[in-house]
Interface confidence: low
């Protein structure tokens, strides 16, 4: 049976021995995971399971990712004939891709007496634990290191059955069970020493593709029992046709329109319905760094900018609290969104003894740093003392207004004496109701902020008995004068709504480095960014016109085309296989000889690193 | 005159983690990109990973999601904290400036990857 497309693939678990329910309930679970099943994806774990389950439902699994676990059962015969290959992805015990242990039951004869496992020619990763199995016959009759690629895996074959027959006369002692088709598949320990993996012969040419796991019927990838690393359409390769390929005429990696993903084991051209795609592979779920977009009707999982979105419950009406307090501080940790209100009142920062509820610590209102969004209001009547501006909300950039407080307010801050700036830096857009800040005794720059650029509509303002502006400006707590006249949410170059200049990752400068400095930079609009690393500095010039690659004015490494690059490309896939270059005398990147295939000094094909094909055996990739 | 001084290399478990220093001097630390590069036996200097003067973090794809580079200006000082290490990633480890990393200007701390 060679390597084809279309398998049935089934989730494997994940409980070790911990199992619940009875015999009978393990049986139907067993049966409904892998009834049909080809591929595991996962582990493969039978545990206490009766001496009467009929197992014959596993007879066409054809590969385990994970591992083998056999553990506690009274059958006699665990049917795996088309097993080929378990990869060992995961492995038992911390190293163990087979693991069979006691299965017998010391009251009755139930046990298990024989593992046939007749196909079974390739362990990718992990060793082999059979213990303690009283009536197993032939384990220690198979050459396991034919089996297992590892040379340093452990196998521990030992205390199994005593009182077992021998292998038939037409094995040479190496047998899954008694008859002559029980016979152990030799596919490495017989091969020719020029074979690096498997053979389907003795002789020298009779190796298999380097690809291939546990075997074959040919020496071409297509003749594989199973595959090493994917199967693209009954080939056996290292990699899928991967996302992006190197474009020669544009120096670039581009979008390859062939490209397949990894799915388990196989090259698919999409990945499965409840599936999304990572970089290059299928995978359940995104990693925690990462969210879920759908781009021209792919689900595919994208690194998100910073945190990761995530709403939250806010606080008030409809809410399950009052205000932010010690008992659901910690439910905001990492939110970027809060879906409701966010009200701070003195019960809930010095405690409600009613309530059973303790001070709040200071420190922890530093989880709002995260928040961008706020759907409803904020409300603020109650501050620490020693916290002088509402920094924590230094990233917060819209409050929406969709509920709101009292009398019609999105913003409302009264009552907190010892406040002497807002600190909201971000904040960009108040949506929809009243802004209300009264009776903050101390607080200044409010009276710079132009509220009417952050309101959609006429900003309704209601703001009275702070500290009077000439009292601010007297003491010199006005914007600083890098700030434009928009105005400014308290002190310094980074408290601006905008810059009278420059702008440097939300700071206010009065010019971008462009020519000097140690770190370069371009502009784009009135903010400034560092060139690309591979850019090198240009002594009293420009550096570089843009943030990519293809934008400096002289390269810190090398230059592949109009890209600076930290090295010349070195096997980096292209649309007829890999593509090596080397650095010429002037640092450009130019093509090996075509026929090189480790890269090269030079152009010619004396100057190929390691083995240079014959040249009827590549074909060319021309730059 | 530039010195770079790296630590915190060591023998560890493959999945297990280590964490590098480099303290830098002789030169405006806070002004530079600094780059960890790695050496494995009998190959040439690989790059790792690069910050930005103000903290802009870059990674080659091996090590993406496992390692994460970091800076204190104020201590002079890049870090380098590998995770779920794998035995790919024994080498010797060099701090270095956006100069070129064929010869090291340091003297780096070797990490191996073993069970």
């Known amino acids: 049976s060679e390597v084809g497309n279309s398998q049935a693939v089934c989730p494997g678990t994940l409980n070790g021995l911990s199992v619940t329910g009875d015999a009978e309930n393990q049986y139907q679970t067993l049966y409904k995971l892998y009834e049909r099943c080809e591929v595991v994806m996962g582990n493969l774990e039978i545990v206490l399971t009766g001496h009467n389950a009929d197992l014959s439902f596993l007879q066409w699994i054809r590969e385990v990712t994970g591992y083998v676990l056999v553990a506690m059962n009274e059958f006699s015969t665990l049917p795996l004939p088309n097993l080929r290959v378990v990869r060992g992805t995961q492995v038992y015990d911390g190293k163990f891709a087979i693991f069979v242990m006691l299965n017998y039951n010391t009251n009755s004869s139930h046990a298990l007496r024989q593992l046939r496992l007749t196909q079974l020619t390739e362990i990718l990763s992990g060793g082999v634990y059979i213990e303690k199995n009283d009536k197993l016959c032939h384990m220690d009759t198979i050459d396991w290191r034919d089996i297992v690629r590892d040379r340093d895996a452990e196998i521990v074959v030992k205390d199994n059955g005593r009182s077992c027959p021998p292998c038939h006369e037409v094995c040479k002692g190496r047998c899954w069970g008694p008859g002559s088709e029980d016979c152990q598949t030799l596919t490495k320990t017989i091969c020719a020493p020029q074979c690096n993996g498997r053979c389907f012969g003795r002789a020298p040419n009779e190796c298999c593709h380097e690809e291939c796991a546990g075997g074959c019927t040919g020496p071409l990838q297509t003749h594989c029992f199973a595959c090493r690393h994917f199967n693209d359409s009954g080939a056996c390769v290292p990699l899928c046709p991967q996302p992006l390929i190197y474009n020669k005429l544009t120096f670039q990696l581009e979008p390859n329109p062939d490209t397949k993903y990894q799915y388990g084991s196989v090259c698919v051209r999409s990945c499965p319905h409840n599936f999304v795609v990572d970089q290059s592979s299928c995978v359940r779920a995104c990693p925690s760094n990462k969210m879920e977009v759908e781009k021209n009707g792919l689900k595919m999982c994208e690194p998100c900018a910073g945190l990761c979105p995530k709403a939250c419950e806010g606080t008030g009406a409809g809410s399950h609290y009052q205000t932010v307090d010690s008992s659901n501080i910690d439910s905001f940790v990492n939110c970027t969104k809060i879906l409701g209100n966010l009200d701070f009142l003195i019960t809930g920062l010095e405690g409600d003894p009613w309530r059973n509820i303790s001070a709040l610590d200071p420190e922890k209102l530093n989880v709002f740093r995260t928040v961008r969004e706020i759907t409803g209001y904020l409300n603020i009547q109650s501050w620490p003392k020693h916290m002088h501006n509402f920094s924590v909300f230094s990233n917060l950039e819209t409050i929406g207004g969709r509920s709101l407080y009292n009398r019609g307010f999105s913003l409302l801050i009264m009552k907190n004496d010892n406040v002497t700036s807002l600190g909201l830096r971000s904040l960009r857009e108040v949506s929809a109701g009243r802004v209300y800040i009264t009776e903050n005794r101390r607080l200044c720059y409010l009276h710079t902020v132009q509220w009417a650029a952050l309101s959609r509509r006429r900003a309704d303002l209601d703001i009275r008995n702070n500290k009077p502006r000439g009292k601010c400006q007297q003491e010199g707590k006005v914007c600083d004068p890098l700030c434009s006249a928009d105005g400014c949410w308290g002190p310094g170059p980074a408290q601006c709504l905008s810059c009278r200049h420059y702008s440097r990752r939300g700071v206010c400068v009065e010019s971008c480095s462009f020519t000097q400095g140690e770190t370069r930079e371009f502009a784009e609009g009135t903010e400034c960014f560092e060139c690309h690393p591979e850019c090198e500095r240009v002594e009293g010039g420009i550096t570089c016109n843009g943030s990519g690659a293809d934008t400096c004015t002289r390269c810190a490494h090398y230059r592949d085309g109009p890209h600076c690059v930290e090295r010349c490309p070195e096997g980096i896939l292209g649309e007829r296989g890999p593509i090596y270059k080397y650095p010429d005398s002037s640092r450009e990147c130019r093509p090996c000889h075509e026929n090189c295939t480790r890269g090269c000094t030079g152009p010619l094909l004396q100057d190929c690193l390691g083995d240079a094909l014959p040249s009827a055996r590549r074909a060319p990739t021309v730059i | 005159e530039v010195q770079l001084v790296e630590s915190g290399g060591g023998l560890v478990q493959p999945g297990g983690s280590l964490r590098l220093s480099c303290v830098a001097s002789g030169f405006t630390f806070s002004s530079y990109w600094m780059y960890w590069v790695r050496q494995a036996p009998g190959k040439g200097v690989e790059w790792?990973?690069?910050?930005?003067?103000?903290?802009?973090?870059r990674y080659t794809d091996s090590v993406k999601g496992r390692f994460t580079i970091s800076r204190d200006n104020a201590k002079n000082t890049l870090y380098l904290q590998m995770n779920s290490l794998k035995s790919e990633d024994t080498a010797m480890y060099y701090c270095?400036?956006?100069?070129?990393?064929?010869?090291?200007e340091s003297q780096g701390t070797q990490v191996t990857v073993s069970s």
């Open positions: 270095a400036r956006l100069t070129s990393f064929a010869t090291p």
């Open positions: 790792v990973s690069a910050i930005s003067p103000g903290g802009v973090e």
